[in-house]
Amino acid sequence: SEVEYRAEVGQNAYLPCFYTPAAPGNLVPVCWGKGACPVFECGNVVLRTDERDVNYWTSRYWLNGDFRKGDVSLTIENVTLADSGIYCCRIQIPGIMNDEKFNLKLVIKPAKVTPAPTRQRDFTAAFPRMLTTRGHGPAETQTLGSLPDINLTQISTLANELRDSRLANDLRDSGATIRIG
């Protein structure tokens, strides 16, 4: 079953997908499509990479991570309700039926009316989890410290863009990443 992600109308949505290249720069083609992953390829392709670069894209769809190191997470800019649905991240590993397929469900919520600014308690209390950050060295574990005064709209942005606390890395535990080679 697909993993579910949420964003509000007007925000950027973030759909995580990772793989580990067998060697630096030894890239595997990846496609992103709207709709569940079919038997082959991606349906309704919105973005595609080859062994070197993004070679097809449609407006509002971007890879903002380092896809040359396997971060093929999709950013959808300025989402509308029409962006809701299943998205397929397909890592096209050479060989017959070797592809890895991830179905991610995007739920778009109507934008909230911004409430008056309120003091937010310690962010670790709201999101009490450890996260693994990716760098060039060994993985390290860190906790989130407290953030300055932020309103509920900002908290919503932090949570559903995921990158703001790098919670996307937790998705490795739920199978949204693959090692190649």
Epitope: D53, V54, N64
Partner: antibody, heavy 118, light 106 residues
Framework: QVKLQESGPGLVAPSQSLSITCTVS????????VHWVRQPPGKGLEWLGM???????DYNSALKSRLSISKDNSKSQVFLKMNSLQTDDTARYYC????????????WGQGTTVTVSS | DIELTQSPAILSASPGEKVTMTCRAS?????MHWYQQKPGSSPKPWIY???NLASGVPARFSGSGSGTSYSLTISRVEAEDAATYYC?????????FGAGTKLEIK
Amino acid sequence: QVKLQESGPGLVAPSQSLSITCTVSGFSLTGYGVHWVRQPPGKGLEWLGMIWGDGSTDYNSALKSRLSISKDNSKSQVFLKMNSLQTDDTARYYCARDRGNHWYFDVWGQGTTVTVSS
Amino acid sequence: DIELTQSPAILSASPGEKVTMTCRASSSVSYMHWYQQKPGSSPKPWIYATSNLASGVPARFSGSGSGTSYSLTISRVEAEDAATYYCQQWSSNPLTFGAGTKLEIK
């Protein structure tokens, strides 16, 4: 509105180190990469390096031994540190946001001029 | 490193003329990107991924090319186009810029 603003020391003595801060607004540093580019007076653009949303970095190999790029997401700041400055490091230093897809820099700061002189 | 060579270094044109500047890469690249810079200002994104105009760029500008040869064309030059234009690639590290083409309006 997306903005980037550099702040630096202006004047640096030879062999000393340089620290420049890029303060951004209108977007989250966790969702975009930020690059550093410099331009010597009357010359072209030179890429120094960048920091990704997840904190990993890429550097120009010619300068890698002297460069360090880091950031503080909560303060929306990116930092450039360069060691062992010489007179040919005199330049205008820019930070710029990466648009995504390994493509181009869609928003640039106004730059900060750094002069290396005794 | 992929070296980008821009030509000509200086281009002089009269208003209304069509002009083309080129950028040659020492190795094949997937895309070329272009920036416009006027004296005293920061570079502005102008054309990305070879042929896509950045926001606010007039339609008289166009970009084309593939492999090692790319170009920026202005169909009818206007006085406000006077600037230096830089090409840039990031098909392989490090990211590199060309030395620039300075467009002067007669």
